[in-house]
Amino acid sequence: LVPHLGDREKRDSVCPQGKYIHPQNNSICCTKCHKGTYLYNDCPGPGQDTDCRECESGSFTASENHLRHCLSCSKCRKEMGQVEISSCTVDRDTVCGCRKNQYRHYWSENLFQCFNCSLCLNGTVHLSCQEKQNTVCTCHAGFFLRENECVSCSNCKKSLECTKLCLPQIENVKGTEDSGTT
């Protein structure tokens, strides 16, 4: 079975690498535009130059192309805590990231939010905070992990998952109560 190719891929595959087939004349292969530029006019004939123009401010192309328009630069999303790591240039999109001691959580492929790295209070750092992953904490005895924070077992309700981790404490509390009866 031949894999299905889109129209553009079909047209490009007829020409050597770095060239594309002229949309009005499939016997002509035009040179693609360099990154940082876009296609203003197709080449008029074989061996003749493609008319490529530089992207305007606020737009870019990151690879060789035959796009009729440059792509709009991304904006870092302040409401998601994002900060600009490097600004957009004609050949590279804006790079957004998080502040120091924060990590990225991807809600979807193209949307991330910055959150503070957990400090593991009442526990120890099992794995340090990374660019795309929060600190992994191990809690001290008498504490259990809830939403990546070490919470006292005194806050453990019987119906919660923490009962296994806090069982000795729960039994101790029960034992103390029992020993108080006469």
Epitope: R77, H105, E147
Partner: nanobody, 119 residues
Framework: EVQLSESGGGLVQPGGSLRLSCAAS????????MVWVRQAPGKGLEWVSH????????FYADSVKGRFTISRDNSKNTLYLQMNSLRAEDTAVYYC????????????WGQGTLVTVSS
């Protein structure tokens, strides 16, 4: 106490439209980024759209871009989702939520409203 209550769901034919609303109370609505997420039958939560407090530069998932419009009325403490050109794959329970700030989980979200797209 934070309360979020969605309405406007229902059965609609492919290509049809619906407008979802989310009434908010118990917090300063005008200061918060608001989110629409959805859960299709047997699937996980999907981020649909969000809108910052000032309503500028909303975000849309690629799957709904050009078809859905998020908006808000800060004077009415209400969030909206206008859904046009609906497809079968938009069938889901739609929830409004406050943008999380402590970690990647939703502390506050509504009970949801079911949108069914079927002929």
């Amino acid at each position: 106490e934070v309360q979020l209550s969605e309405s406007g769901g229902g059965l609609v034919q492919p290509g049809g439209s619906l407008r979802l609303s989310c009434a908010a109370s118990g917090f300063t609505f005008a200061h918060e980024t608001m989110v629409w997420v959805r859960q299709a039958p047997g699937k996980g939560l999907e981020w649909v759209s969000h809108i910052p407090p000032d309503g500028q530069d909303p975000f849309y998932a690629d799957s709904v871009k050009g078809r859905f419009t998020i908006s808000r009325d800060n004077s009415k403490n209400t969030l909206y989702l206008q859904m046009n050109s609906l497809r079968a794959e938009d069938t889901a329970v739609y929830y409004c939520a406050l943008l999380p700030n402590r970690g990647p989980w939703f502390d506050y979200w509504g009970q949801g409203t079911l949108v069914t797209v079927s002929s």
